[in-house]
């Protein structure tokens, strides 16, 4: 099939005191090969500070996956979800606390 770029969505949720978990989800993409990782101050975080979901079919002939990391509250703006798919990339910041969703269809 032809390339279908991911829809990328960043959310935040309360973790322990002083920390939040930020999750970056990529969905509705094809082919299944994708890079999804958190960056801090422009540089990718180490593998052991992130948790990844499997790349799974979403039932429409496309795929979905996610990556999450725990960060200090107040430091959100230093973090960006980096997505790379089929030679294209995009970056997705963490929304401020009063809004929990950032949907971006990468072209």
């Amino acid at each position: 099939g032809s390339t279908v770029p991911p829809m990328v969505n960043v959310t935040r949720s309360e973790a322990s005191e002083g920390n939040i978990t930020v999750t970056c989800r990529a969905s509705s993409f094809y082919p299944r090969n994708i890079i999804l990782t958190w960056r801090q101050d422009g540089v990718s975080l180490s593998h052991d500070t992130q948790q990844w979901g499997d790349v799974l079919p979403d039932g429409n002939g496309t795929y979905q996956t996610w990556v999450a990391t725990r960060i200090c509250r107040g430091e959100e703006q230093r973090f960006t979800c980096y997505m790379e798919h089929s030679g294209n990339h995009s970056t997705h910041p963490v929304p401020s606390g009063n809004s929990h969703h950032h949907h971006h269809h990468h072209h």
């Epitope: 960056r39 101050d41 703006q77 030679g87 294209n88």
Partner: antibody
Framework: EVQLVQSGAEVKKPGASVKVSCKAS????????IEWVRQAPGQGLEWIGA????????NYNEKFKDRATLTADKSTNTAYLELSSLRSEDTAVYFC??????????WGQGTLVTVSS | DIQMTQSPSSLSASVGDRVTITCRAS??????LAWYQQKPGKSPKLLVY???TLADGVPSRFSGSGSGTDYTLTISSLQPEDFATYFC?????????FGQGTKVEIK
């Protein structure tokens, strides 16, 4: 010290192409995205696109997607912007910049591209 | 695309004056806003990022504030070296967009 040094001024005819270089030093080139921005004479700033020098993956402003090509050479720590099918309105100063998370912290000195018949 | 409307387009002020420049985004940019100073023939210099964080080496007379769609750059006491053009830029989503600039001139 982080430095981005760009190639010199260019004069091109309409319909031609131009390739501007941006040589990085003072940091790990493949760790950070390189962004490209232009500024027409007396005008504001316009984002062209970005490249991951480590992988070569790109992100283009839709306005430039058909005419701009971003590349990077890891062996020389150099990023390139090639703009094709030049027209007079492409006359501008072209800047490269480093993306530090969620802002541009260091900029090249700029390259003036003049398109004139 | 998010449009950035900057005002005023120019202003005349004297050394020692307090100067305020505003930038309004067409949508919520979650404080992902930077301010730059540019002098003729030079590249932009980062002053403020994340709406209110002063970049290294920037004098404390500069300050940024705002959230959501409305942002402000303030120079508390204008100095001779501050006469320049100032731009805002949003980093919430690509294409990253800039305000049209504010030229600060000597009265």
């Amino acid at each position: 010290e982080v430095q981005l040094v760009q190639s010199g001024a260019e004069v091109k005819k309409p319909g031609a192409s131009v390739k501007v270089s941006c040589k990085a030093s003072g940091y790990a080139f493949t760790n950070y995205l390189i962004e490209w921005v232009r500024q027409a004479p007396g005008q504001g700033l316009e984002w062209i696109g970005a490249i991951n020098p480590g992988s070569g993956a790109t992100n283009y402003n839709e306005k430039f997607k058909d005419r701009a090509t971003l590349t990077a050479d890891k062996s020389t720590n150099t990023a390139y912007l090639e703009l094709s099918s030049l027209r007079s309105e492409d006359t501008a100063v072209y800047f490269c910049a480093r993306f530090l998370g969620n802002y541009f912290d260091n900029w090249g000195q700029g390259t003036l591209v003049t398109v004139s018949s | 695309d998010i449009q950035m409307t900057q005002s005023p387009s120019s202003l005349s002020a004297s050394v020692g004056d307090r100067v305020t420049i505003t930038c309004r985004a067409s949508g919520n940019i979650h404080s992902y806003l930077a301010w730059y100073q540019q002098k003729p023939g030079k590249s932009p210099k980062l002053l403020v990022y994340y709406a209110e964080t002063l970049a290294d080496g920037v004098p404390s007379r500069f300050s940024g504030s705002g959230s959501g769609t409305d942002y402000t750059l303030t120079i508390s006491s204008l100095q001779p070296e501050d006469f320049a053009t100032y731009f805002c830029q949003q980093f919430w989503t690509t294409p990253y967009t800039f305000g049209q600039g504010t030229k600060v001139e000597i009265k």
